[in-house]
């Protein structure tokens, strides 16, 4: 997260980290006791899922292995459209005050809505500095028309843009798959942005979760 600050303790109980061994790979969100939602570009063969603590490496955190993951069938490694994936935990997460399910959206929030993006990704770019504590930054949703003015043909349907004019505030490497939460519901998953991160007036691009609630629910049902 660029130009952010540590999240208020326990304010993101649905936030998870996907680890490769002990190393941060991506962010994600807990959908229910068995399922994590993340970005399709975060695909690995096996995951260790960190839940229940804002601090990576915290011994009190839950750590659950996951071996099965289901990318959206329309995901493209070329255009990064449909950049979402469900990861099935090998054992159930224990819900608590620090481990809660995210609220999936029942509607798409409009441009101008203030949202929070969070993650353990690098706080500097292009040189990397990985924080141990979960970082947050507030950004505003940007209309597809305004975002297309910036990214032209790089932008596809079901991609959502967010940022702050003339500001560096943005997600970055390591935040991928993590949540963009607006008015208490999950509206985006960190997908991509300009590198180095934090170029002023280059918004962050997110997978627009409100367009995929049916696929999310159908996929969890299908692979119960």
């Amino acid at each position: 997260i660029i130009d952010g600050a540590p999240c208020a303790r326990g304010s993101h109980p649905w936030q998870v980290a996907l680890l490769s061994g002990n190393q941060l790979h991506c962010g994600g969100v807990l959908v229910n006791e068995r399922w994590v939602l993340t970005a399709a570009h975060c695909k690995m063969n096996e995951y260790t899922v960190h839940l229940g603590s804002d601090t990576l490496g915290d011994r009190r955190a839950q750590r659950i292995k996951a071996s099965k993951s289901f990318r959206h069938p329309g995901y493209s490694t070329q255009t990064h459209v449909n950049d979402l994936m469900l990861v099935k935990l090998n054992s159930q997460a224990r819900l608590s005050s620090m481990v809660k399910k995210v609220r999936l959206p029942s509607r798409c929030e409009p441009p101008g809505t203030t949202c929070t993006v969070s993650g353990w990704g690098t706080t500097t770019s292009p040189d990397v500095t990985f924080p141990s504590d979960l970082m947050c930054v507030d950004v505003k949703l940007i209309s597809p028309q305004d975002c297309t003015k910036v990214y032209k043909d790089l932008l596809e349907n079901s991609m959502l843009c967010a940022g702050i004019p003339d500001s560096k505030k943005n997600a970055c490497n390591g935040d991928s798959g993590g949540p963009l939460v607006c008015r208490g519901t999950l509206q985006g998953l960190v997908s991509w942005g300009t590198f180095p991160c934090g170029q002023p007036n280059d918004p962050g691009v997110y997978t627009q979760v409100c367009k995929f609630t049916k696929w999310i629910n159908d996929t969890m049902k299908k692979h119960r």
Partner: antibody
Framework: QVQLQESGPGLVKPSQTLSLTCTVS??????????WNWIRQHPGKGLEWIGS???????YYNPSLKSRVTISVDTSKNQFSLKLSSVTAADTAVYYC??????????????WGQGTLVTVSS | DIQMTQSPSSLSASVGDRVTITCQAS??????LNWYQQKPGKAPKLLIY???NLETGVPSRFSGSGSGTDFTFTISSLQPEDIATYYC?????????FGGGTKVEIK
């Protein structure tokens, strides 16, 4: 189809400043998600990235050349430029301008100019 | 800086042969690895990006694989027009760096 064209003097005297301009057509230099780069190739040798500039004006330089390099952009003319000061014979090379798709997920040089040979000699 | 070690520096093969070039990064670069073809007197041309994605319009006989530190570029059936120098390039960190190149010739 994006096209890039380098222009500038082919001969520069030692200790002077090498100046090149890259004119972009078929695409806007102010598009987000791309960087505009200078890369050079010494005669018979490999490729060396010199530096890049973004639509925002942010610049990034190779540390090995940083003290001598300035890259600037003129969005109104859809051009970007390279200045390399205090040149020596070791700066004799073919200089390429190139566009990079440069995202957190993917980064590569997709369009290149044809290159211009700059010789440093008195 | 990340060092890119490419091998071999040159090779000679017959038309129709399978040609393999390797590239090793001095540290983990995930899949931020690209391959370019350069013909004499011309600018480099992108063939493969993100280690394994074929650039639009590039023949399918070209392919790439690998992640982390070890990468491979393959021409499944060498054609006369493939005579060129091939470069790998890492895009994980600035400054972006290139391998030393592999010159491919026809026997």
């Amino acid at each position: 189809q994006v096209q890039l064209q380098e222009s500038g003097p082919g001969l520069v005297k030692p200790s002077q400043t090498l100046s090149l301009t890259c004119t972009v057509s078929g695409g806007s230099i102010s598009s987000g998600g791309y960087s505009w780069n200078w890369i050079r190739q010494h005669p018979g040798k490999g490729l060396e990235w010199i530096g890049s500039i973004y639509r925002s004006g942010s610049t990034y330089y190779n540390p090995s050349l940083k003290s001598r390099v300035t890259i600037s952009v003129d969005t109104s003319k859809n051009q970007f430029s390279l200045k390399l000061s205090s040149v020596t014979a070791a700066d004799t090379a073919v200089y390429y301008c190139a566009r990079a798709k440069q995202l957190t997920l993917t980064r590569y040089f997709d369009y290149w100019g044809q290159g211009t040979l700059v010789t440093v000699s008195s | 800086d990340i060092q890119m070690t490419q091998s071999p520096s040159s090779l000679s093969a017959s038309v129709g042969d399978r040609v393999t070039i390797t590239c090793q990064a001095s540290q983990d670069i995930a899949n931020y690895l690209n391959w370019y073809q350069q013909k004499p007197g011309k600018a480099p041309k992108l063939l493969i990006y993100d280690a394994s994605n074929l650039e639009t319009g590039v023949p399918s006989r070209f392919s790439g694989s690998g992640s982390g530190t070890d990468f491979t570029f393959t021409i499944s059936s060498l054609q006369p027009e493939d005579i060129a120098t091939y470069y790998c390039q890492q895009a994980s960190q600035l400054p972006f760096t290139f391998g030393g190149g592999t010159k491919v010739e026809i026997k």
